[in-house]
Interface confidence: low
């Protein structure tokens, strides 16, 4: 397959919320029409994929109901949304992204987002 | 199991327009993994790609015959169809419908089942 | 457009033979290449795909390589029933082109 440059941010903070976003963008070689959205942790040599959407371009992604991922596309950028995320989550995420329709399939790997994310301390007990 | 079956006239008068359609049984035509091609083979000849369409209704032709064709689909009737506009002799051919489908991970694309054919022939 | 030469356009073989078709593109494409055979009256069948991958439930005889420009459809022990017309096809760029056939005939 053929090669593509992906950019994404080094590292990115989750919020209080567990709710963590970032860019990732594409230098689209062609005139893709179907692109195929990957996000894959990192931690410790191992990586699994977290979400997944394959959307037409200038359509909205669509990850599955399930999904803790969520994403809009604007040309060669997609905004990535990822949730319900803990502390224990932290890891290096992995944006990959397939250029699927017309061919030539193209392939691109992000260097990946450090996202660290903190569980919020619990509230302290109040009197009233 | 899928099933394509192409359905339409057998016969077109030159300068009119070729109608076609696929009926797809088995499988939506609405699944984002697949698309659906026309492929035709003149009589005793090879074969020619004609276009793809994807259920969204994004199309791709053959530049070749790009002035001439339109491919729509119908994903409430399961449906995709060919017309090819001003026919000659020379678009007498044996027509097959097909679905496109991608391998993941290789970037490949192939047909890899299709309608038994259906041959049109241009004669006044 | 790329152009797809196939050689030999004929070929008779006996069966048990050893055949090898060759496929040429006019440019590369990597290995976007498939394999088709197609018998008289009836639709292809996919064969081969990715250039070297074998389509699920055809038989073990049958064998693709190449990339680039120059691709290969091998059939190691011919068969009565492989008798028929073989077609690359090429899904690099558009327009999908096939080659122009191949008709492997009874010796």
């Known amino acids: 397959c053929k090669a593509m440059h992906v950019a994404q941010p080094a590292v990115v903070l989750a919020s209080s919320r567990g709710i963590a976003s970032f860019v990732c963008e594409y230098a689209s070689p062609g005139k893709a029409t179907e692109v195929r959205v990957t996000v894959l942790r990192q931690a410790d040599s191992q990586v699994t994929e977290v979400c997944a959407a394959t959307y037409m371009m200038g359509n909205e992604l669509t990850f599955l109901d399930d999904s803790i991922c969520t994403g809009t596309s604007s040309g060669n950028q997609v905004n990535l949304t990822i949730q319900g995320l803990r502390a224990m989550d932290t890891g290096l995420y992995i944006c990959k992204v397939e250029l699927m329709y017309p061919p030539p399939y193209y392939l691109g790997i992000g260097n990946g987002t450090q996202i660290y994310v903190i569980d919020p301390e619990p509230c302290p007990d109040s009197d009233f | 199991q899928l099933q394509l079956q192409e359905s339409g006239p057998g016969l077109v008068k030159p300068s009119e327009t070729l109608s076609l359609t696929c009926t797809v049984s088995?499988?939506?035509?609405?699944?984002?993994?697949?698309?659906w091609g026309w492929i035709r083979q003149p009589p005793g000849k090879g074969l020619e790609w004609i276009g793809s369409?994807?259920?969204?209704?994004?199309?791709y032709y053959n530049p070749s015959l790009k002035s001439r064709v339109t491919i729509s689909v119908d994903t409430s009737k399961n449906q995709f169809s060919l017309e090819l506009s001003s026919v000659a002799a020379a678009d007498t051919a044996v027509y097959y419908c097909?679905?496109?489908?991608?391998?993941?991970?290789?970037?490949?694309?192939?047909?890899?089942?299709w309608g038994q054919g259906t041959l049109v022939t241009v004669s006044s | 457009d790329i152009q797809m030469t196939q050689s030999p356009s004929s070929l008779s073989a006996s069966v048990g033979d050893r055949v090898t078709i060759t496929c040429r593109a006019s440019?590369?494409?990597?290995?976007?290449l498939n394999w088709y055979q197609q018998k008289p009256g009836k639709a292809p069948k996919l064969l081969i795909y990715?250039?070297?991958s074998l389509q699920s439930g055809v038989p073990s005889r049958f064998s693709g390589s190449g990339s680039g420009t120059d691709f290969t459809l091998t059939i190691s022990s011919l068969q009565p029933e492989d008798f028929a017309t073989y077609y690359c096809?090429?899904?690099?760029?558009?327009?999908?082109?096939f080659g122009q056939g191949t008709k492997l005939e009874i010796k």
């Open positions: 097909a679905r496109v489908s991608y391998y993941y991970g290789s970037g490949s694309y192939y047909f890899d089942y």
């Open positions: 088995g499988g939506s035509i609405s699944s984002s993994s697949y698309y």
């Open positions: 369409i994807y259920y969204s209704g994004s199309t």
């Open positions: 440019q590369s494409i990597s290995s976007y």
């Open positions: 990715a250039a070297s």
């Open positions: 096809l090429q899904h690099n760029s558009y327009p999908y082109t």
